[in-house]
């Protein structure tokens, strides 16, 4: 079944279906799925020239 575009901002999609705590809503497939945690960048030591790349923890299984 074909679905129309949707945004990560939820601008043009209905509010995501509530998901259980270990899940989040995947706008691509319109479904609650297992979801890992985003890890924010760690501050670099003083004098470091560029921000650390953003990385992620492995998703929960």
């Amino acid at each position: 079944m074909r679905r129309g575009p949707r945004s990560l901002r939820g601008r043009d999609a209905p509010a995501p279906t509530p998901c259980v705590p270990a899940e989040c809503f995947d706008l691509l497939v319109r479904h609650c799925v297992a979801c890992g945690l985003l890890r924010t960048p760690r501050p670099k030591p003083a004098g470091a020239s560029s921000p650390a790349p953003r990385t992620a923890l492995q998703p929960q299984e």
């Epitope: 939820g10 899940e23 809503f25 691509l28 479904h31 799925v33 890992g36 998703p59 299984e61």
Partner: antibody, heavy 125, light 107 residues
Amino acid sequence: EVQLVESGGGLVQPGGSLRLSCAASGFTISSNSIHWVRQAPGKGLEWVAWITPSDGNTDYADSVKGRFTISADTSKNTAYLQMNSLRAEDTAVYYCARRVCYDRARVCAGAMDYWGQGTLVTVSS
Amino acid sequence: DIQMTQSPSSLSASVGDRVTITCRASQDVSTAVAWYQQKPGKAPKLLIYSASFLYSGVPSRFSGSGSGTDFTLTISSLQPEDFATYYCQQSYSTPPTFGQGTKVEIK
């Protein structure tokens, strides 16, 4: 360890059928969406279909709609791609992949993180 | 369908070079873009997701940026193992579509 293993590829005549399998281990397919992506010889990647195994929702590329059917058996932790009315242009390596999600304000920030090794489908007379 | 246009289609570079690959979407895809690396005869490997997040285990010389329609993959210092083909992919709407690929070759 997360692993996806495809099987079922081979040589088939135009108009014929094949069924590809994607056996998953190290995670439960019902928690994710499973995708099939193909790559014709010397060409780029083309998404084929996806399924959310927990409820059976599916979607297909226009190029295969009506000919291919994606399905899943959660008890076997396996996804399938039934390919009918095969054409020469379906010749490709077929990969299955898991779409992973990271929580961005309870909305998925996702991509395909684990892929199988691929299985070659050749459609030729 | 949303079209993803990569440039260049191929490039030649040397070890240590800074390499930039761009991807342009035919419409706004927010930050729903991933980048993959593929070597001959192998399955693609995820590098970057959500436009700028480095996937677990990927070397920090890889970085991604962009939102809306314009996206960039940068390799800060090219290593011998980085010679491969790179693909962008949008997952803003179904069908998820890939760019045509950028082959990074040894100069």
